[in-house]
């Protein structure tokens, strides 16, 4: 019903998200040289971060390196860091893949393994795979409420995706509940043909597209959102190109008057909300 | 080869960045009343923050105020805060440039210098210049990998800037390696005619533009990114207008059950990634 | 004076904001069972976060739950969590509104109130209203400097909203000072017909629109910003749909080698800066 000669206006949009859910996490710790499982509960403040813009992030997996301090220590053993004598190490060298600056000495890492010594945050983070299954695998049951207020300033018209009378215990479904603004994370992945549990291991980027199809004429007035989903990261990436989505962050603290940190390599899903559409009017 | 009557489509884009590099930082401490340099190593978790959207940030310089707690103390001496008697201070006054609320008393700061007393996080942050050279001056050797997946939904066409077979030890060069998605920070600045070491002192904003020039016709198909760079902040700013790019953040901790904080004024480069382009098709 | 046959170019924009101001906050604490008011001073590092993109956030209110640790404890009493026997609780159940995982036991919360026991960060956050008036109600006197550099790449033309000779002690006023880039937060709300003190309680989202009206022809050259404001969140939201703007974050620390956290529910204003406009040229 939109006419070609209608005036089309871009949309001004504001997005606010609320993630809900808790996850039971089974972490492996070492106590007196024995591996042991401890249970923790992760809530919103633990797994999501106050994000800006049209994005939110949910942590699905992690690797921790506890009790790091600035000192000298051997590099974690890899093909690049193993050595047999000081000749294999170069004082002042910073390997782009390394986490420290070489002292020029080749020292014992463990047993008969020797690696180049570095000045760094020690002990050095291990080079290891993300846990399988993902520690917050149950995040697929988390839900996100998306509040989207839009504005066609040229038409002086404002609306929003949550209208009075909405049953807020709803969950979005493409056919049975296409206007519900509460999305189960696992369902979003099902819609794009992806498996949440697989993506949760390494992380990824998921697009939530909100298309506003609006005819602002009095006679044919309609203006409501259509939700669709699109996997935005690359599913099949060479391991050397950092597949998935992860970043490192540190929790700093003082112990015995010395600054220490816990380094956390966080894997998770970044959800990008893309709002577009036009408002046509004579 | 693009025809005027081709259908042009806007691009949907997703960006993910990975910064690599370590910096040796020489911090000044006071030992026995004598200033002394100590070395620290800064890695990704120390100098960059998990960013959303199409931005990433690299810290290049900083000023620290350690051991602050909420109490009464004299303001840091400046023309605005010096006083000779209580008449020069106003109880309850909050100067926009100040960091505390005046008590109305004029007290000794040091020697014969007197300033207005305030309730604040004390000791008050000093009004001082950013260190020269920048403490993380060596950040110019850091590299950033930019992963950009794009989508022309109207044409049901998806591609990305990293194609199979890419040599990931490459570094971008305008003529010799224009498709390499790994950028040395110093090179980006060289491209815009700026000197990284200068900008690193006060910080700045740098644009990385990715222009997708795509013809999606079967016959003339081409679709690849062109990278260009643009300094986005203002190089020549009046000092009163906060040149560069900086912000303050705090690390909170408890000591003897009292909340304390380390205040850090962080200077650095915010990189904004701007993705644009159109896909033409009959 | 713009001609229809001028070539119109979109704008590339970079935004940098600086918030200034301090707030005196009166927090209620309980000491030996007695409620007591303590005064604190909040400065930029306490109430704002280093934000990316075209957004900044100012905390205006908060609720704290101190000394949480992972253990078993009774849920906070609400209609959903009250119980009279273990039959009212279900082992392993995670209520989406809850903060923990039920153990299956019904235990005493206080007096004769019993609730389902959970494994969680304990003590559980209370379900309570945001403080009235807002704890950082005085944030309406904070100011924000907005630096906006723009670029019409097609015309090779760059400008910015802060020109030499600007009196930087100015404050924006729609008629008396429409080019001043320093905005008092309370004034922004007055412009949109909102009351800062009301919005500060629950938080909200405010749009700052910068429209660049530019004619880049030599003869009719003009290019300057017009500032306008638009409330972006929904003023009249059903309480079940999370009115306002808030998020939770945690400050983690160690006590006697046990990880603890202070949970903070932060309410505040997110300011979204929307830059648009076109540059016309023959």
């Amino acid at each position: 019903s939109d006419k070609l000669y209608q005036r089309k206006e871009p949309v001004i949009s504001s997005v606010h998200t609320k993630v809900k859910g808790i996850a039971e996490v089974k972490e492996e710790i070492v106590e007196n040289g024995v591996k042991k499982l401890v249970h923790s509960v992760f809530d919103t403040a633990d797994y999501t971060f106050p994000l800006q813009g049209n994005s939110f992030f949910v942590m699905t997996n992690f690797l921790k390196t506890e009790g790091q301090e600035q000192r000298l220590c051997p590099e974690y053993p890899t093909r690049r860091t193993l050595c047999s004598s000081d000749r294999g190490c170069k004082k002042g060298w910073m390997d782009p893949q390394s986490k420290g600056i070489q002292t020029g000495r080749c020292v014992v890492y463990e047993g008969n393994q020797k690696t180049c010594e570095v000045s760094a945050w020690c002990p050095i983070e291990a080079v290891e795979e993300a846990p399988r299954p993902a520690l917050l695998n149950s995040a697929e049951n988390f839900t996100v409420l998306i509040k989207n207020n839009i504005d066609f300033p040229g038409h002086n018209y404002t609306t929003r995706n949550i209208l009075p009378g909405l049953n807020i215990t709803c969950t979005f479904h493409k056919t049975q509940n296409p206007q519900c603004p509460i999305f189960r994370l696992g369902d979003i992945f099902r819609e794009t043909g992806d498996n949440f549990s697989d993506v949760a291991i390494q992380g990824g980027i998921m697009g939530i597209e909100i298309y506003w199809d609006c005819n602002l004429d009095r006679w044919f007035h309609h203006c409501h959102p259509k939700y669709s989903f699109r996997r935005l990261d690359d599913k099949t990436t060479n391991v050397s190109l950092y597949p998935g989505y992860n970043f490192r962050y540190a929790k700093y603290y003082k112990e015995n008057n010395v600054e220490k940190r816990t380094l956390i390599k966080v894997f998770g899903i970044r959800f990008d909300i893309l709002v577009f559409g036009t408002g046509g009017k004579f | 080869s693009d025809k005027l009557y081709q259908r042009k489509e806007p691009v949907i884009s997703s960006v993910h960045t990975k910064v690599k590099g370590i910096a040796e930082v020489k911090e000044e401490i006071v030992e026995n009343g004598v200033k002394k340099l100590v070395h620290s190593v800064f890695d990704t978790a120390d100098y960059t923050f998990p960013l959303q959207g199409n931005s990433f940030f690299v810290m290049t310089n900083f000023l620290k105020t350690e051991g602050q707690e909420q109490r009464l103390c004299p303001e840091y001496p400046t023309r605005r805060t010096l006083c000779s008697s209580d008449r020069g201070c106003k109880k309850g006054w909050m100067d926009p440039q100040s960091k505390g609320i005046q008590t109305g008393r004029c007290v000794v700061y040091e020697g014969n210098q007197k300033t207005c007393e305030v309730s604040a996080w004390c000791p008050i942050e000093a009004v001082e210049e950013a260190p020269r050279p920048a403490l993380l001056n060596s950040a110019e050797n850091f590299t950033v990998l930019i992963k950009n997946n794009i989508d022309f939904p109207g044409h049901n066409y998806t591609t990305r800037n990293i194609l199979p077979g890419l040599n990931i030890t490459c570094t971008f060069h305008k003529t010799q390696n224009p498709q390499c998605p790994i950028f040395r920070l110093g090179d980006i600045f060289r491209e815009t005619g700026d000197n990284f070491s200068d900008v690193a002192i006060q910080g700045g904003i740098m644009g990385i533009e990715i222009y997708w020039d795509c013809n999606l016709d079967r016959w003339f198909h081409h679709c690849h990114p062109k990278y260009s760079f643009r300094r986005l902040d203002d190089k020549t700013t009046n000092v009163s207008l906060y040149p560069g790019y900086n912000f303050r953040y705090a690390k909170y901790y408890k000591e003897n059950n009292v909340e304390k904080r380390t205040l850090i004024k962080v200077f650095g480069i915010r990189f904004d990634i701007l993705v644009f382009g159109t896909g033409g098709k009959f | 004076s713009d001609k229809l046959y001028q070539r119109k170019e979109p704008v590339i924009s970079s935004v940098h904001t600086k918030v200034k101001g301090i707030a005196e906050v009166k927090e209620e604490i309980v000491e030996n069972g007695v409620k007591k008011l303590v005064h604190s001073v909040f400065d930029t590092a306490d109430y704002t976060f280093p934000l990316q993109g075209n957004s900044f956030f100012v905390m205006t209110n908060f609720l704290k739950t101190e000394g949480q640790e992972q253990r078993l404890c009774p849920e906070y009493p609400t209609r959903r969590t009250l119980c009279s026997s273990d039959r009212g609780c279900k082992k392993g159940w995670m209520d989406p509104q809850s903060k923990g995982i039920q153990t299956g036991r019904c235990v005493v919360y206080e007096g004769n109130q019993k609730t389902c026991e959970v494994s969680a960060w304990c003590p559980i956050e209370a379900v309570e209203e945001a403080p009235r008036p807002a704890l950082l109600n005085s944030a309406e006197n904070f100011t924000v400097l907005i630096k906006n550099n723009i670029d019409f790449p097609g015309h090779n033309y760059t400008t910015r909203n802060i020109l030499p000779g600007l009196n930087i002690t100015c404050t924006f006023h729609k008629t008396q000072n429409p080019q001043c880039p320093i905005f008092r937060l309370g004034d922004i709300f007055r412009e949109t017909g909102d009351n800062f003190s009301d919005v500060a309680i629950q938080g909200g989202i405010m749009g700052i629109e910068i429209y660049w009206d530019c004619n880049l022809d030599r003869w009719f050259h003009h290019c300057h910003p017009k500032y306008s404001f638009r409330r972006l969140d929904d003023k009249t939201t059903n309480v079940s749909l999370y009115p306002g703007y808030n998020f939770r974050y945690a400050k983690y620390y160690k006590e006697n080698n046990v990880e603890k956290r202070t949970l903070i529910k932060v309410f505040g204003i997110r300011f979204d800066i929307l830059v648009f406009g076109t540059g016309g040229k023959f």
């Epitope: 009790g67 000192r71 000298l72 000495r105 010395v258 | - | -």
Partner: nanobody, 118 residues
Framework: EVQLVESGGGLVQPGGSLTLSCAAS????????MSWHRQAPGKQRTLVAD???????EYEDSVKGRFTISRDNFKNTMTLHMNSLKPEDTAVYFC????????????WGQGTQVTVSS
């Protein structure tokens, strides 16, 4: 002026215990790795135990399980608890300090004599 002062040495019987202390002044103690070294008559000085500012410890093989090094960064002190002492532990024990990223020590104490004999 930098000073490292050792105390606690003395005569002890085999199987006995002793605690050595080292008090530091004039250095930013929490930036220094501290160590104990020993020198038996007519022999080279050797490393016994080392502790980083944050408490990471390393021991020479012959003392593992018998000696414990610790430090207090508020009091600027370091201690060495020595148990199950043997005659071959007899030596002058030196306290040393090195900046956390240095390979060799910057400062040394004067030493304290430990004699293990029946």
């Amino acid at each position: 002026e930098v000073q490292l002062v050792e105390s606690g040495g003395g005569l002890v019987q085999p199987g006995g215990s002793l605690t050595l202390s080292c008090a530091a002044s004039g250095i930013a103690f929490n930036y220094y790795s501290m160590s104990w070294h020993r020198q038996a008559p007519g022999k080279q000085r050797t490393l016994v135990a080392d502790i980083s500012p944050g408490g990471h410890t390393e021991y020479e093989d012959s003392v593992k399980g018998r000696f414990t090094i610790s430090r207090d960064n508020f009091k600027n002190t370091m201690t060495l608890h020595m148990n199950s002492l043997k005659p071959e532990d007899t030596a002058v024990y030196f306290c040393a300090a090195r900046l956390r990223f240095e390979v060799s020590s910057n400062y040394w104490g004067q030493g304290t004599q430990v004699t293990v004999s029946s």
